[in-house]
Interface confidence: medium
């Protein structure tokens, strides 16, 4: 693990990756270009996922947070031998399945996913995986696309959430490790510190919630700040401003000393949730204080 | 609001081109994807193409190479060309708009009733 | 082709009636079944979007469930207007194909 530029962010990153017949010679620089990108995901509450498809698609690990687990899917991930068809569909088939199974056990996790292929889709699988895509969004994921070598950028911006969430790679596959920092850059959402992080009992606050990626949304107006209070009942707050390196958000009354709010933001109006470490508390305050 | 009309003959005679277009109003065909159905005396409903935002197509094979579906940006329409007409093809013909986000046809035209016959 | 059967080719119920109507696929299709409302001399409305998510605009009278390859459209207490043929189809690959539709009636 190379130091560097790191993401702190705990939500579930979903790694989809071509390994049809034309990547044959080139399976090795995907396999680092992950292993590079997958260290710098530091989050103990981050969960990972490696899918891999050709004509089906495979899930290589399930989602884990399990850094045992991740090694050995990395390791798992290496040997992989390319061969068949472009069938990205079922790679974000087997995506949405998890997501939607999360989302049934009651984790409202965010859900990050990066895909990477080679080719140009021939037209139906490019509907399906345009409607896959659009499956996965639908069950609040964000999708990145990595395209290499032959790739049509158009088809790729329609299963990516914009032009923007595309990283076109021209340069062929050893270019991949030039685009992990900006990859980690804007695939990141975390949540580093709020201010002020004690704020007293019964009194109304704003806080300042620090971090990164929050204009990542597709739609900056369904950005919530939500605060999970004593592990139980959670208040979603909608935030006065949103800017990509913070929020301002209202602190909900919290009546009593001692009380913890857990911090969250949601990009999708509460559809689900990324999670952090930063907990706000409430002390006593006198008057005039 | 959108819409969608579609036009063309009535009655065709056998072994004659079916062709038909669909009008839309209230949306750009060049964004989502733009399709045929037809439904048949007994209320039998079939699938038969669409054209996609970007011009490409897809079509049902049980239709084989009789089928071509093409479009003109310029007036919004799109139309279908059906060859080698027989008495089995005679149906009510429906233009509907087709978006992946929902995966199904959210619109549709009222439709135009084609008969086969010599 | 994806084979999608429908059951009962028709039902005729009474105004106030809860009713089911059925749909198979010849595999397994996920949620990927829409439901369509066809009535007579109309063209067919989208009723309910895979398999259970509501259209806006149409009664909360009309639901669906289902996934895999069994699916219904429930309609919790019929009204006269809701007569016509019900639809379901297959929205999950290509051709798409639709069932032979079940034909509502009020007794």
């Known amino acids: 693990e190379d130091g560097g530029p790191a993401c702190y962010g705990g939500f579930d990153l979903y790694f989809i990756l071509d390994k049809s017949g034309s990547v044959l010679h080139h399976w090795n620089e995907i396999y680092y270009f992950v292993e590079q990108l997958a260290h710098k995901f530091i989050s103990p509450q981050l969960r990972m996922s490696f899918i891999v498809f050709s004509t089906r698609g495979t899930t290589l690990m399930k989602l884990t947070e399990d850094r045992e687990q991740i090694r050995q899917g990395l390791e798992e991930l290496q040997k992989v031998l390319p061969g068949g068809d472009t069938y990205m569909h079922e790679g974000f088939e087997r995506a949405s399945e998890q997501i939607y199974y999360e989302n049934r056990q009651g984790y409202r996790t965010a859900s990050v996913i990066i895909a990477l292929t080679d080719g140009e889709l021939h037209e139906d699988l490019f509907f399906y995986s345009e409607r896959e895509a659009n499956r996965s969004r639908d069950l609040g994921a964000i999708v990145y696309c990595v395209g290499v070598k032959d790739f049509n950028e158009t088809q790729l911006a329609r299963i990516a959430d914009s032009k923007d969430h595309v990283f076109p790679v021209n340069d062929g596959f050893q270019a991949l490790q030039g685009i992990i920092h900006s990859i980690l850059k804007k695939s990141c959402i975390e949540i580093l510190a709020a201010e002020p992080s004690t704020i007293c009992a019964g009194e109304s606050f704003q806080v300042v919630v620090r971090g990164n990626g929050f204009r990542h949304a597709r739609n900056v107006d369904r950005v919530l700040c939500s605060f999970k209070i004593n592990d139980s009942v959670t208040l979603n707050e909608k935030p006065f401003s949103v800017e990509d390196t913070y929020l301002l958000c209202p602190a909900p009354i919290l009546k009593e000393v001692g009380m913890k709010a857990a911090l969250q933001v949601s990009m999708n109006d509460g559809l689900s949730f990324i999670s952090s470490s930063v907990i706000i508390t409430t002390t006593h305050c006198s008057d005039g204080s | 609001e959108v819409q969608l009309q579609e036009s063309g003959p009535s009655l065709v005679k056998p072994s004659q081109t079916l062709s038909l277009t669909c009008s839309v109003t209230g949306d750009s065909i060049t964004s989502d994807y733009w399709n045929w159905i037809r439904k048949f005396p007994g209320n039998k409903l079939e699938y038969m193409g669409y054209?996609?935002?970007?011009?490409?197509?897809y079509t049902n094979p049980s239709l084989k190479s009789r089928i071509s579906i093409t479009r003109d940006t310029s007036k919004n329409q799109y139309y279908l060309q059906l060859n080698s007409m027989t008495t089995e093809d005679t149906a009510t013909y429906y233009c509907?708009?087709?978006?992946?986000?929902?995966?199904?046809?959210?619109?549709w035209g009222a439709g135009t009733t084609v008969t086969v016959s010599s | 082709d994806i084979v999608m059967t429908q059951s009962p080719a028709t039902l005729s119920v009474t105004p106030g009636d809860r009713v089911s109507l059925s749909c198979r696929a010849s595999?397994?299709?996920?949620?990927?079944l829409h439901w369509y409302q066809q009535k007579s001399h109309e063209s067919p409305r989208l009723l309910i979007k895979y398999a259970s998510q509501s259209i806006s605009g149409i009664p909360s009278r009309f639901s669906g469930s289902g996934s895999g390859s069994d699916f219904s459209l429930n309609i919790n207490s019929v009204e006269p207007e809701d007569v016509g043929v019900y639809y379901c189809q297959n929205g999950h690959s290509f051709p798409y194909t639709f069932g032979g539709g079940t034909k509502l009636e009020i007794k």
């Open positions: 054209i996609s935002y970007s011009g490409n197509t």
């Open positions: 509907a708009r087709y978006k992946t986000i929902d995966s199904s046809f959210d619109v």
């Open positions: 595999q397994n299709i996920r949620d990927f």
